[in-house]
């Protein structure tokens, strides 16, 4: 088992439509063919899984399990997009990368991206 460096941006601001995108980049020490990417959210002391995907290198990244995430992969980079975010979803989003196959197994955990979500102001009533 080996450790692996994972880089991700420190801060991202979600769009007014509740969409946040960031890149998760890992320093792959070997030629992995199967990679698992998990996005975790830490708020207070609670850690919850946001979404996860296992993909074969060179293939499309597919998030299953009715995911709020989409993504694409290019080499050792994963471009992640989280949708449907609201102000209450503000928190630290950690990118976890596992090189599943072939052995040896590698695990890397990023320092997290603080995603800020601001709910849009409702449109004021108008007499016009």
């Amino acid at each position: 088992c080996k450790a692996m460096h994972v880089a991700q941006p420190a801060v991202v601001l979600a769009s007014s439509r509740g969409i946040a995108s960031f890149v998760c980049e890992y320093a792959s020490p070997g030629k992995a063919t199967e990679v698992r990417v998990t996005v975790l959210r830490q708020a207070d002391s609670q850690v919850t899984e946001v979404c996860a995907a296992t993909y074969m290198m060179g293939n499309e990244l597919t998030f299953l399990d009715d995911s709020i995430c989409t993504g694409t992969s290019s080499g050792n980079q994963v471009n992640l997009t989280i949708q449907g975010l609201r102000a209450m979803d503000t928190g630290l989003y950690i990118c976890k990368v596992e090189l599943m196959y072939p052995p040896p197994y590698y695990l890397g955990i990023g320092n997290g991206t603080q995603i800020y979500v601001i709910d849009p102001e409702p449109c004021p009533d108008s007499d016009f």
Epitope: C1, T48, E49, L64, D65, E98, M100, Y105, I109
Partner: antibody
Framework: EVQLVESGGGLVQPGGSLRLSCAAS????????MSWVRQAPGKGLEWVAT????????SYPDSVKGRFTISRDNSKNTLYLQMNSLRAEDTAMYYC???????????????WGQGTLVTVSA | DIQMTQSPSFLSASVGDRVTITCRAG??????LAWYQQKPGKAPKLLIY???TLAEGVPSRFSGSGSGTEFTLTISSLQPEDFATYYC?????????FGGGTKLEIK
């Protein structure tokens, strides 16, 4: 209160099949990764299978790969283990377990059911 | 597979004693180690995860330490309800293997 109740164990002949169930309550079942762990009589613990929250990802050790299938029905809050081509060495108490993330961002078997006994014998 | 070796396999002690159980991993597992307690006829119970973090509701007399390949579980002052079998398990990669167990008996 988290509750996991296994059922479906029993006596089966070598080469036979069995389907175990685990009824979950006291938490939002669809939000958690779930696993099966077994323990042969008088022996230690062995991880058997894991399934992701929505069932899209499964994992098995080599000892059961190709013979056992883990699945879940989130609408029924139930976890399953389909066991085929059973062997004498599969005789064990089978526990279902809920996995939680700790501060290290890795899963732990946080809650366990009381188990259901599977005996494979002629 | 990463082999997990526990020692001793059996341990006799008295109420009030301080006991230490050791778990060795076949390769570096960093701090990805859990300890479980199992009483006869019961399911295992999570005691410690991440090598040293106490699970919810676990008494403070239990503590874990170590990283890399060497880990210990310490019970500072044994209580009657602590006599059980203890297992370590790594959670780093797959398969997630357990140690063989340490049976803690009353002297």
């Amino acid at each position: 209160e988290v509750q996991l109740v296994e059922s479906g164990g029993g006596l089966v002949q070598p080469g036979g099949s069995l389907r175990l169930s685990c009824a979950a309550s006291g938490f939002t079942f669809s939000s958690y990764t779930m696993s099966w762990v077994r323990q042969a009589p008088g022996k230690g613990l062995e991880w058997v299978a894991t399934i992701s929250r929505g069932g899209g990802y499964t994992s098995y050790p080599d000892s059961v790969k190709g013979r056992f299938t883990i699945s879940r029905d989130n609408s029924k809050n139930t976890l399953y283990l389909q066991m085929n081509s059973l062997r004498a060495e599969d005789t064990a108490m089978y526990y279902c377990a809920r996995e939680d993330y700790g501060s290290s961002y890795v899963h732990w078997f946080a809650y366990w059911g009381q188990g259901t006994l599977v005996t494979v014998s002629a | 597979d990463i082999q997990m070796t526990q020692s001793p396999s059996f341990l006799s002690a008295s109420v009030g004693d301080r006991v230490t159980i050791t778990c060795r991993a076949g390769e570096n597992i960093y701090s990805y180690l859990a300890w479980y307690q199992q009483k006869p006829g019961k399911a295992p119970k999570l005691l410690i995860y991440n090598a040293r973090t106490l699970a919810e509701g676990v008494p403070s007399r239990f503590s874990g330490s170590g990283s890399g390949t060497e880990f210990t579980l310490t019970i500072s002052s044994l209580q009657p309800e602590d006599f059980a079998t203890y297992y370590c398990q790594h959670h780093y990669g797959s398969p997630r293997t357990f140690g063989g167990g340490t049976k803690l008996e009353i002297k």
